[in-house]
């Protein structure tokens, strides 16, 4: 018999694999939903179940999951069925493993750290490579050297500073220079040499309604590549923007509702109202995407429990063009990159 999806957190005990290979049906159609949606614990998303029927509280990391009881997409979770072979009916919510990277023709898996050469240590995170320098020689010691020179030292990876401006002094290597300069307390070597890197924001994960956008940045205290995320809403799903296109025009680049409203997220409400701009639509094959935007911080207040803040895409202007054959494809903006096929697959 089919199990109707339930609104509460689900726990399942899979039958021993040798006992059954029949796959239970967790969805029943037509949909059957409780008269009112469940109240989810703080931080747990209220989402539509995997049967596309009822509102449920999303399964969290480590929870059991099924076709009906799906994992929290807002937390980047997916249902890993690998432990339920051969039925693949009941899984466990796991963190989404991002796409790998290709650098100089070499493929790296997501999360893999590697050294493309002796001077850099790199990490692949969700298709983006972030690197930190291993050669931590400071700036040349200004204390006495007016004409410093960066030279390769046989048998060593990192170049070192030498000073040519004083014939009376023997050539100094970086070891001496580093000691002299570090003693002065003028620089913290590791972060002085951090090559700041921030990737562009990925396209919004949805073409309408609330989605998520991510980027990689090493602009942090450890100079380590980390994924940042922000919420995005390119356009509302519940407004027919085409109705707002002026007569004789084919596009409305920007749609802005007349009323200011609060943002809502997982049952929590923004502490102030906003009147955001959204990207519009076209009646032809063009699509409209942001080209002037920024990230703002929005504070949310929850009915029960503490509030929180989230980074949110704030659109200032959009443009409409033909460069979006599949606007749902979050990797669409990589198509012009070399090795796109490798990254996307």
């Amino acid at each position: 018999t089919a199990l109707s999806p339930t609104p509460t957190t689900m726990t399942f005990t899979p039958a021993p694999l040798e006992e059954t290979t029949t796959r239970p049906e967790f969805c029943k159609w037509p949909c059957e939903c409780p008269q009112s949606p469940p109240r989810c614990p703080l931080g747990v998303s209220l989402i539509t179940d995997g049967c596309e029927c009822c509102k449920i509280c999303a399964q969290q990391l480590g929870d059991n999951c099924t076709e009906a009881a799906i994992c929290d997409p807002h937390r980047g979770l997916y249902c890993d069925y690998s432990g339920d072979r051969p039925r693949y009916a009941i899984g466990v919510c796991a963190q989404v493993v991002g796409v790998g990277c290709v650098l100089d023709g070499v493929r790296y898996t997501n999360g893999e750290s590697f050294q493309p050469n002796c001077r850099y240590n790199c990490t692949c995170i969700d298709g983006t490579v972030g690197c930190t320098p291993l050669c931590l020689s400071p700036r040349p010691p200004r204390l006495w050297c007016r004409q410093p020179r960066h030279v390769r030292v046989p048998g060593q990876c990192c170049e070192q500073w030498v000073c040519d401006d004083d014939a009376r002094r023997p050539r100094q290597t970086a070891l001496l220079d580093t000691r002299a300069f570090a003693a002065s307390g003028a620089v913290e070597q590791r972060y002085e040499n951090c090559i700041a890197y921030t990737s562009p924001w990925s396209p919004c994960s949805t073409t309408c309604g609330l989605g998520i956008s991510t980027r990689i940045s090493n602009v942090n205290a450890r100079c380590w590549p980390e994924q940042e995320s922000r919420l995005c809403n390119l356009r509302p799903c519940d407004v027919d923007i085409q109705l707002h296109i002026k007569a004789g025009k084919k596009c409305l680049a920007v749609y802005q509702p007349e009323e200011a409203t609060n943002f809502t997220l997982a049952g929590c409400v923004s502490t102030r109202t906003y009147r955001p701009k959204y990207c519009g639509v076209c009646t032809d094959n063009r699509c409209c995407i942001p080209y002037k935007s920024k990230t703002i911080s929005v504070d949310f207040q929850c009915p029960e429990g503490p509030g929180f803040s989230r980074q949110v895409l704030w659109i200032n202007a959009c443009f409409c063009n033909l460069s979006c054959r599949n606007p749902n494809d979050i990797f669409a903006d990589l198509e012009s990159y070399p090795d796109f096929e490798e990254i996307a697959n």
């Epitope: 037509p30 059957e32 939903c33 009112s36 539509t48 309408c208 799903c237 519940d238």
Partner: antibody, heavy 121, light 107 residues
């Protein structure tokens, strides 16, 4: 206000094809299952097809299976019905209807005004 | 497929009358039944859902009852605007099915 507006109805020859559209407004389109229901002249109502909120699940009446294809575009708030291999029995007013699954399962709560499809040589 | 049989298929009544329309299902459908009103050239309009719940905006003279296989729609105190065709719909299982309709005419 909540509204469904069908279009695309026409006179078509037997064996021909037609694509109906239904434009939705006034509600969160991507939250609802949607259906097509038809009514032959002077006859009763007949359910044709239903589609889930993100197109993952689809159901058809036996009378149209293999000939009709239901689809939707949530970005455009639109529902479609592609009708192939049409015959005189498909002559009807075609309604798009919203399934009320937000609170329990309660059938169709919103209907469009209908669009007429006539199959005749 | 579940078959719905409405009775009567047509009915003549006067303004102010109380009328009852019955819908029988070929198998149990719990309370997954709705009643719809349709006027000529118009789309159907939902009156009752879940067998007995009144749709918002529908006058309280309309009421529904029943569960399982036997359902009734009652209109107490007919008004001139109530003369139309009434359909029952089961949404307990696919394919959804409608009753053949009951035509309510002015006597």
């Amino acid at each position: 206000q909540v509204q469904l507006v069908e279009s695309g109805g026409a006179l078509v020859q037997p064996g021909g094809s037609l694509r109906l559209s239904c434009a939705a407004s006034g509600f969160t389109f991507s939250d609802h299952w949607l259906s097509w229901v038809r009514q032959a002249p002077g006859k009763g109502l007949e359910w044709v097809s239903s589609i889930s909120s993100s197109s993952r699940y689809i159901h058809y009446a036996d009378s149209v299976k293999g000939r009709f294809t239901i689809s939707r575009d949530n970005a455009k708030n639109s529902l479609y019905l592609q009708m192939n291999s049409l015959s005189a029995e498909d002559t009807a007013v075609y309604y798009c209807a919203r399934e009320d699954t937000s609170m329990a399962t309660n059938g169709f709560d919103v209907w469009g005004q209908g669009t007429m499809v006539t199959v005749s040589s | 497929a579940i078959q719905l049989t409405q009775s009567p298929s047509s009915l003549s009544a006067s303004v102010g009358d109380r009328v009852t329309i019955t819908c029988r299902a070929s198998q149990g459908i719990r309370n997954h039944l709705g009643w719809y009103q349709q006027k000529p050239g118009k789309a159907p309009k939902r009156l009752i859902y879940a067998a007995s719940s009144l749709q918002s905006g529908v006058p309280s003279r309309f009421s529904g009852s029943g569960s399982g296989t036997e359902f009734t729609l009652t209109i107490s105190g007919l008004q001139p605007e109530d003369f139309a065709t009434y359909y029952c719909l089961q949404h307990n299982s696919y394919p959804f099915t409608f009753g053949q309709g009951t035509r309510l005419e002015i006597k």
